[in-house]
């Protein structure tokens, strides 16, 4: 078992003439989403196999609205890695396709509009347990650029997630601090612990302590972005040596719409009109709709039949997501008590218990006094299942083993100076106050104040 | 239980090298990162730079670059910083520090050795 | 280079008071801030890291607070035992950068 884990660091038009200004156009702010699905294999055939190795879908990115005359930045994205865990061993060679979906938040009837807008598929060598590997790929008019990596989740390791790990003593090849796996000593206990605090997204290491950046990023903890050149060119090919781009050809100069699709110029950019079919600002991608098979573990397709029509899934119990990717984390409610590990096993959720708690939910606390020290004269009590120290006077604490400085809470009022006593505390009170605790002033008939400290007092800290 | 010990105070003179050490006792020292602090007084706490005693790795502030040179010896625990063509300048008391397991910042300090640069 | 203020530079405070201690940086460092305690004859203590988190073993009566660019470090209930000189430095960039301390006198 493990978990591929997908890290996408920029969207956006790609280099070149009539690259798109905006995923948007003219059709008011929308918000792009991510959708990943994986397939085992190389062989040609696996292209139009379903995402067997599993598929995740990331969050909504922040809203997009275009803005008129500015340059075509990278979009906004949704945050955090898209993480697709799988159950059985990983396969070594697979295809990775990511998809990157639009959602239009403009007056739209029957709410948002979903549309594909770029697919990239590519198939993959990849070891688990390896560094992040980086990509950029191209997709018509859009460029993504990611980074990827699989990851075996303990006790499983190896490059294929296949070998369980029982730490052996004998020394090993595994490098500092690591120590090899039954039953081939070739295997390591864990990937290494990379410097604390470095950036999970970011950042990665091949030895303990390291934290080595991936591409942009920089810092001890890879979490400062590299500064990029500000480039006020809109598009075109690059023809100075800052690396900026200067305006090129107009929009739809070549017709940049495929598989039949009329080009129409927006300004700053271009629309294509696509055939029925085909999606994408360059018409160069096929629309899901249910035939695809996007609704993962036994979700109910709806809708969808027109490539025009976005579909919803209807997911099973204990799954939920767009695409019924996600199964619904019941642990994450926390129901085990006491420090226990919550374990769901799909039928039903377990508590493993902590030492000295049981029941269902580890409700009960099993401890009693008879193993209870209640330290310096403490008296232990029971009561519903739970045990305390009564502490004697002086001492606190959970077992009374810390000393307790009766004057510590300042409990004189009006300046009043505060004295520790065997049996307590007493306060001297500033002239024109009395009281256990200084805290009634002085009535105009002439009460007269506590003495200064009665003698066999030991004298604490005034307070101020 | 983690320890960081320094070597002694050191009395060099102008244009002398000196090789500072830093033992480390108490965990794993490939995979904790050394940091070299400098501290003169009127000037606060300066980073000079870090290294990793498992790779080899460092990193330094362009500042001590040419100055500083940070070396480890794993089999000893010893991390070592060397500081060339010394001036008076020099002169202050260095730390060593661990970057912590767990910890995003440094949760062990050595000592700290005295260096005096004088004719 | 993240330049770092701190302020002030002095302060002199009695038992049982709660003192402040800032720390401002030139540009963000999201959270990435640490705090030490300097004493003669001791070596540094580290007292909070990533601007907020207690490390442990030190006393309740130290917090920290901030992120970006300002920071800030609470002593509530001063004892004898915390007049010392504190640093901040900032672990977001390298150079890493301390800022110029804090000496806490008694009053």
């Known amino acids: 078992a493990g978990v591929f884990e997908l890290q996408i660091h920029s969207f956006g038009p790609g280099p070149g003439p009539g690259a798109p200004r905006s995923p948007c156009s003219a059709r008011g702010p929308c918000r792009l989403f991510f959708r990943v699905c994986l397939k085992p294999g190389l062989s040609e055939e696996a292209a139009e196999s379903p995402c067997a190795l599993g598929a995740a879908l990331s969050a909504r990115g922040p809203v997009y609205t275009e803005q008129p005359e500015a340059p075509a930045p990278d979009l906004p994205l949704p945050n955090g890695l898209l993480q697709v865990p799988f159950r059985d061993a990983w396969p070594g060679t697979f295809s990775l396709i990511i998809e990157t979906w639009r959602e239009e938040l403009g007056d739209q009837i029957g709410g948002p509009a979903w549309s594909l807008l770029a697919r990239v598929t590519r198939r993959r060598r990849l070891a688990a347990g390896g560094p992040w590997a980086r990509d950029i790929q191209r997709a018509g008019a859009w460029e993504l650029r990611f980074s990827y990596r699989a990851r075996c989740e303990l006790p499983a390791v190896g490059t294929a997630c296949t070998r369980l790990c029982r730490p052996r003593s004998a020394p090993s090849r595994c490098g500092p601090g690591l120590r090899p796996c039954a039953p081939l000593e070739d295997e390591c206990e864990a990937p290494p612990v990379c410097r604390a605090g470095c950036s999970l997204e970011h950042g990665f290491c091949e030895q303990p302590g390291e934290c080595r950046c991936l591409e942009g990023w920089t810092g001890p903890l890879c979490m400062v972005p590299v500064s990029t050149s500000s480039c006020l060119g809109l598009r075109g090919p690059s023809s100075t040596t800052t690396g900026c781009l200067v305006p090129g050809p107009g929009p739809c100069d070549g017709n940049p719409c495929a598989n039949g699709g009329s080009c129409s110029e927006t300004p700053g950019s271009f629309e294509c009109t696509c055939p029925r079919g085909f999606y994408g600002l360059r018409c160069e991608v096929s629309g899901v709709t249910c035939a695809d098979g996007p609704c993962f573990n036994g979700g109910l397709c709806v809708g969808g039949a027109d490539p025009d029509s976005a579909y919803i899934c209807h997911c099973p119990p204990g799954f939920q997501g767009s695409n019924c990717e996600k199964r619904v984390d019941r642990c994450s409610l926390q129901p085990c008590r006491n420090g226990g590990l919550c374990l769901d096993l799909g039928h039903a959720l377990r508590c493993r218990c902590r030492a000295g708690f049981a029941g269902p939910r580890c409700e009960h606390d099993l401890d009693d006094c008879a193993g209870r020290a209640c330290a310096n004269g403490g008296t232990c009590v029971e009561g519903g299942g739970a045990h305390r120290c009564s502490c004697a006077l002086g001492f606190g604490g959970r077992n009374c083993r810390e000393r307790a400085d009766p004057c510590a809470a300042r409990p004189c009022a009006h300046g009043g100076r505060c004295y520790a006593h065997f049996s307590g505390l007493v306060c001297a009170c500033a002239p024109g106050y009395m009281g256990a605790r200084c805290e009634f002033p002085v009535h105009p008939d002439g009460v007269s104040a506590l003495p200064a400290a009665p003698p066999g007092l030991r004298p604490g800290d005034p307070q101020r | 239980q983690v320890q960081l010990q320094q070597s002694g105070t050191e009395l060099m003179k102008p244009g002398a090298s000196v090789k500072l050490s830093c033992k480390a006792t108490g965990y794993t020292f490939t995979g904790n990162w050394i940091e070299w602090v400098k501290q003169r007084p009127g000037h606060g706490l300066e980073w000079i730079g870090e290294i990793l005693p498992g790779t080899g790795s460092t990193q330094y502030n362009e500042k001590f670059k040419g100055k500083a040179t940070f070396t480890a010896d794993p089999s000893s625990n010893t991390a070592y910083m060397q500081l060339s063509s010394l001036t008076t300048e020099d002169s202050a008391i260095y730390y060593c520090?661990?970057?912590?397991?767990?910890?995003?910042?440094?949760?062990?300090w050595g000592q700290g050795t005295t260096l005096t640069v004088s004719s | 280079d993240v330049q770092i203020t701190q302020s002030p530079s002095y302060l002199a405070a009695s038992p049982g008071e709660t003192i402040t201690i800032n720390c401002r940086a030139s540009k963000s460092i999201s959270k990435y801030l640490a705090w030490y305690q300097e004493k003669p004859g001791k070596t540094n203590k580290l007292l909070i890291y990533?601007?907020?988190t207690l490390h442990s073993g030190i006393p309740s009566r130290f917090s920290g607070s901030g992120s970006g660019t300002d920071f800030t470090l609470t002593i509530s209930s001063l004892e004898p035992e915390d007049f010392a000189i504190y640093y901040c430095q900032q672990h977001n960039e390298y150079p890493l950068t301390f800022g110029g301390g804090t000496k806490l006198e008694l009053k």
């Open positions: 990533s601007g907020s």
């Open positions: 520090a661990r970057w912590g397991s767990t910890v995003v910042a440094y949760d062990y």
